[in-house]
Interface confidence: low
């Protein structure tokens, strides 16, 4: 399907006359009909086989012819076919007077023609105008022509018919030959196919529209190229789909079991060493100087309230230095010039006078300690709580906050390992001095029994069509990981895709 | 929408020279002929020059002969008018368009018409 395409340029006709040799009367008003048909050796009468157009009258004698296809007009001539242009034709353009406003055939006087040309020959289709100029005695034409294909037909006979799209059959538009030109981000044959993000894994992710990575079960990403492992998997990688490999360190079927306290927190301060003693235990060695559970404390020679009755303590270069209250003097301000009409006893301490009045002393209530009973008591000085427990004053006692895996008063007993059933799938716990031991059911192996040795849901190869089979461990069930195109729980059923490509 | 803009008038002693331009848009300048008119002060258009599409054939009013120079680009979709020895009678407004009409002598009926420049040649 297509059109040729005659455009008028000039029409010279000085003496105004008919191919008679009559002249027009005022003028030739002149008006063209156009015959396009199949080639012939010698252009004859007969049915314009290509198709027949006509113009409405475009001038006088000599003129020039509006090009008018900008406007809608009828310049260039039109002549439309429906078939493969054969690539050869005939034209005849002939050129009529018109007396009045009438141009059907019938209406015009029998000599009313001016002029008539008529060629032939071949014509490819393209944008290009062929130039032509035709001479009589009387008459020039000037004019031009060419054959271009409809919408949507293309190729060198226009025989091709592609119609660009952009829906769920296919992204392209047509090249000048009719084929497709797929869209930017689609491939395939019809296009259909779009081009995911750059990068995405081929087996493990896929696209439904360009520059996307949608991953399958059991990957992740941005590309679709990190698996996930299993779930509540803690510490752990893998390297397919729901496994849980444990970091160093890590132990337990879902690797959550601190086997190494002192490299994940770094509880030892002022470069103490650390010393793992089991699951989320550990102990300190300080450095001199230093003291506390995890030597964060820097001793100094105060720190053991050497000045009594209430002196201060200042720390010197060499020792240090006792700033005594009034009434007292000495190295620890031990001499006391009061005596108990002074009422030295603080916080409701009873004075027993000495020597004669020449000293005292006070009797402190419970919670109170000091020459004065000017200090609180202070139970937790003397660390009594074991294997890194937390001392707390409640009062006139305290307690103990104990680390996980210890109990007692003073946190000295050890929690039984087997208390938190760290035995997998049935195994049996039994308690050992430094530690614990799982005896396995049939079926299963390792440290917890984490280890499935006989049982195994991929066994039977229950995935289709060449699919990855995946062990869920805690649910004895297998995944199938499907190639591109198939779908289905064990990858049995084939992506449905268009039988043909619909027009 | 079509459009043909004029510049390059002015003021110009005798003897002296411009150049007119007309800047065709809307339509497929290549495949029309184009022609320059004139309109002298308190007279009717006169036809002064035109030229074929393709640039191969070119005419000219027998009061411009051997002084004006018509040509176009059509890669540029502009139509020049080169006037040289100008004389006082050259003074007019001068419209590009395009002609659709031929007398004996040269165009006579137009399509499409610019706004026009003006040019005035005194001393």
């Known amino acids: 399907s297509g059109v040729f395409q005659l455009q008028l340029q000039e029409f010279i006709n000085e003496r105004g006359v008919l191919a008679s040799g009559r002249p027009c009367e005022p003028g030739c008003r002149t008006f063209f009909r156009v015959c396009l048909k199949h080639f012939q050796a010698v252009v004859s009468p007969g049915p314009c086989t290509f198709g027949t157009v006509s113009t409405p009258v475009l001038g006088t004698n000599s003129f020039a012819v509006r090009d008018d296809s900008s406007g809608g007009g009828r310049n260039p001539l039109q002549l439309p076919f429906n078939f493969t242009w054969p690539g050869t034709f005939s034209l005849i353009i002939e050129a009529w007077h018109a007396p009045g406003d009438d141009l059907r055939p019938e209406a015009l006087p029998p000599d009313a023609l001016i002029s008539k040309i008529a060629i032939q020959g071949s014509l490819a289709v393209g944008q290009n105008w062929l130039l032509d100029e035709q001479t009589s005695t009387l008459t020039r034409l000037r004019y031009s022509y060419r054959v271009i294909c409809s919408d949507n037909y293309y190729g060198d006979n226009c025989s091709r018919l592609c119609k660009k799209r952009n829906d769920h059959f296919g992204h392209y538009v047509c090249q000048p030959d009719g084929n497709l030109s797929c869209l930017p981000g689609w491939t395939g044959e019809y296009c259909q196919q779009p081009i995911c993000l750059s990068g995405c894994h081929e087996q493990n992710g896929y696209c439904s529209k360009p520059a996307e990575c949608l991953c399958r079960p059991g990957w992740q990403g941005r590309l679709c190229n990190e698996c996930i492992p299993h779930n509540g998997c803690r510490h752990g990688t893998c390297s397919t789909p729901w496994q849980c490999t444990c970091d160093e360190g890590w132990g337990g079927l879902f690797c959550d079991q601190d086997l190494n306290y002192c490299t994940h927190h770094s509880p030892c301060k002022n470069g103490a060493t650390c010393s793992n003693s089991g699951q989320r235990s550990y102990t300190c060695t300080c450095r001199p100087g230093y003291t506390g559970v995890d030597c964060e404390l820097e001793l100094s020679e105060c720190d053991s309230n050497p000045c009594r009755n209430g002196g201060s303590c200042k720390d010197q270069e060499d020792g240090y230095h006792c700033l005594c209250p009034p009434g007292y003097y000495g190295l620890h301000c031990e001499h006391s010039t009061l005596s108990c009409a002074d009422s030295p006893c603080f916080n409701g301490g009873s004075c027993r006078e000495r020597n004669q009045g020449a000293n005292y002393a006070c009797e402190c209530p419970p919670n109170f300690t000091g020459s004065n009973c000017e200090k609180k008591v202070d139970r937790c000085t003397s660390n009594p709580c074991a294997n890194g427990g937390q001392c707390l004053n409640r009062g006139p006692s305290r307690m103990c906050r104990c680390r996980p895996g210890f109990t007692g008063t003073y946190c000295e007993l050890h929690v039984s390992d087997c208390a938190r059933n760290p035995c997998a799938h049935g195994g049996t716990c039994h308690d050992l001095e430094n530690g614990l031991m799982c005896t396995c059911p049939a079926g299963f192996s390792g440290r917890r029994c984490e280890v499935r040795t006989s049982i195994d849901a991929c066994a039977s190869s229950p995935c289709f069509n060449r699919a990855t089979c995946y062990t869920d461990l805690s649910t004895d069930t297998f995944v199938c990981n499907c190639p591109y195109g198939f779908v289905g729980s064990r990858c049995e059923f084939p992506v449905g895709l268009p039988p043909s490509f619909p027009w | 929408e079509v459009q043909l803009v004029e510049s390059g008038g002015g003021l110009v002693q005798p003897g002296g020279s411009l150049r007119l331009s007309c800047a065709a848009s809307g339509f497929t300048f290549g495949n029309y002929d184009m022609s320059w008119v004139r309109r002298p002060p308190g007279k009717g258009p006169e036809w002064v020059s035109a030229i074929n599409s393709g640039g191969g054939s070119t005419y000219y009013a027998d009061s411009v002969k051997g002084r004006f120079t018509i040509s176009r680009d059509n890669a540029k979709n502009t139509l020049y008018l080169q006037m040289n020895s100008l004389k006082p009678e050259d003074t007019a407004v001068y419209y590009c368009?395009?002609?659709?009409?031929?007398?004996?002598?040269?165009?006579?009926?137009?399509?499409?018409w610019g706004q026009g420049t003006q040019v005035t040649v005194s001393s």
């Open positions: 368009a395009t002609p659709r009409g031929w007398g004996p002598t040269g165009p006579h009926e137009y399509g499409y």
